[in-house]
């Protein structure tokens, strides 16, 4: 990740807004504060981004390297099967879930995990870099 404004000014990757980080063609925002899943989704949408939808194992692995033990909301929900917010199924990883009332997805350095959607967690937004 090119951690432009979080750790250093990085002239080679100026294309993400302040406090966002660049990886490939995308910018990522890792929140410090905590919100429920819906509020996290709304935060991202208001910034022309979406709650993190992970495209493949490589991206997931890279993001997990950056994360701590703390869970962060991602754009994953259980609507008759685990699906990303764009409707695509979760197919490159499993989500740890054995409760039928935990229907929102979160990620930390170790795993994808189901949680009750009203729990306040940090979150990750993602958008295409300019």
């Amino acid at each position: 990740l090119c951690q432009g404004s979080k750790y250093s000014t990085c002239a080679s990757c100026p294309s993400c807004p302040d406090h966002w980080m660049k990886y490939g063609n995308h910018c990522y925002y890792f929140s410090v504060e905590k919100k429920d899943w819906i509020s996290s989704l709304e935060f991202c949408l208001a910034r022309d981004s979406h709650l993190l939808m992970i495209t493949d194992k490589q991206e997931m692995s890279l993001l997990q390297d950056f994360l701590s033990e703390a869970f962060h909301w991602v754009g994953l929900r259980n609507n008759s099967g685990w699906r990303w917010e764009d409707g695509s199924p979760l197919n490159f990883s499993r989500i740890y879930s054995n409760s039928l009332v935990q229907t929102c997805g979160a990620i930390n350095k170790n795993s994808l995990q189901a949680s009750s959607c009203e729990v306040s967690l940090q979150w990750v937004c993602k958008k295409v870099s300019p």
Epitope: D36, F71, Y96, N98, S99, L100, V101, Q102, A106, Q113, A114, S115, S116, E118, V119, S120
Partner: antibody, heavy 125, light 112 residues
Framework: QVILKESGPGLVKPTQTLTLTCTFS??????????IGWIRQPPGKALEWLAH???????SYNSALKSRLTISKDTSKNQVVLTMTNMDPVDTATYYC?????????????????WGQGTTVTVSS | DILMTQSPLSLPVTPGEPASISCRSS???????????LEWYLQKPGQSPRLLIY???NRFSGVPDRFSGSGSGTDFTLKISRVEAEDVGVYYC?????????FGAGTKLELK
């Protein structure tokens, strides 16, 4: 699948301490959002929540019984233990453990999706 | 503590007929997060309770659609559209919105 099973002494004398064990499988009590609660039911009466414990070791107790209750977990054995001191005949009941789900408040919970079959405890001299 | 008052305490019903159980809380049980953690459990004779409805109106997995929950604030209702023999048992309402979590006294549904 998720299974919970309670075990206990069956018969306890007044003033003695009751120790109950809930042994579970099908999930881990180290997993974010998971908890186990204890609920009791005196013969022919309603259900009463006693205590619960969360994955992060946070605990909550029924305030009326708090001074008598201790809940703990042993994640390596997949067990939760409830102790209740100074037992009295009015504590005669079936004691259940149930898995609880976190929604943001450590002091309470929702959705007891899975219950044990219960263990009967009689308090009598 | 929040008192959960159920009525009736006993409910004889003819198979195929509807049934309705009321649960009233002594104070509003909407949580500060906007959700209402009101649940219904059925305890069949000789068995442990099992979850039927959570968050007022959400049917738990495997629960037949003849069961429905409704209500808000302090007044809640469990309805069975057509009672079947397997529905016999004691129905409990439960609130987890406020500390301590509390159960109602139960409603015993029996067949006429």
């Amino acid at each position: 699948q998720v299974i919970l099973k309670e075990s206990g002494p069956g018969l306890v004398k007044p003033t003695q301490t009751l120790t109950l064990t809930c042994t579970f499988s099908g999930f881990s009590l180290t997993t974010f959002g998971m908890g186990i609660g204890w609920i009791r039911q005196p013969p022919g009466k309603a259900l009463e929540w006693l205590a619960h414990i969360w994955w992060n070791d946070d605990k909550s107790y029924n305030s009326a019984l708090k001074s008598r209750l201790t809940i703990s977990k042993d994640t390596s054995k997949n067990q939760v233990v409830l102790t209740m001191t100074n037992m009295d005949p009015v504590d005669t009941a079936t004691y259940y453990c149930a898995r609880t789900i976190y929604y943001g408040n450590y002091l309470t919970f929702y959705a007891m999706e899975h219950w044990g079959q219960g263990t009967t405890v009689t308090v009598s001299s | 503590d929040i008192l959960m008052t159920q009525s009736p305490l006993s409910l004889p019903v003819t198979p195929g007929e509807p049934a309705s159980i009321s649960c009233r809380s002594s104070q509003n049980i909407v949580h500060s997060n906007g959700n209402t953690y009101l649940e219904w459990y059925l305890q069949k004779p000789g068995q442990s309770p099992r979850l039927l409805i959570y968050k007022v109106s959400n049917r738990f997995s495997g629960v037949p659609d003849r069961f429905s929950g409704s209500g808000s604030g302090t007044d809640f209702t469990l309805k069975i559209s057509r009672v079947e023999a397997e529905d016999v048992g004691v129905y409990y309402c439960f609130q987890g919105s406020h500390v301590p979590p509390t159960f109602g006294a139960g409603t015993k549904l029996e067949l006429k």
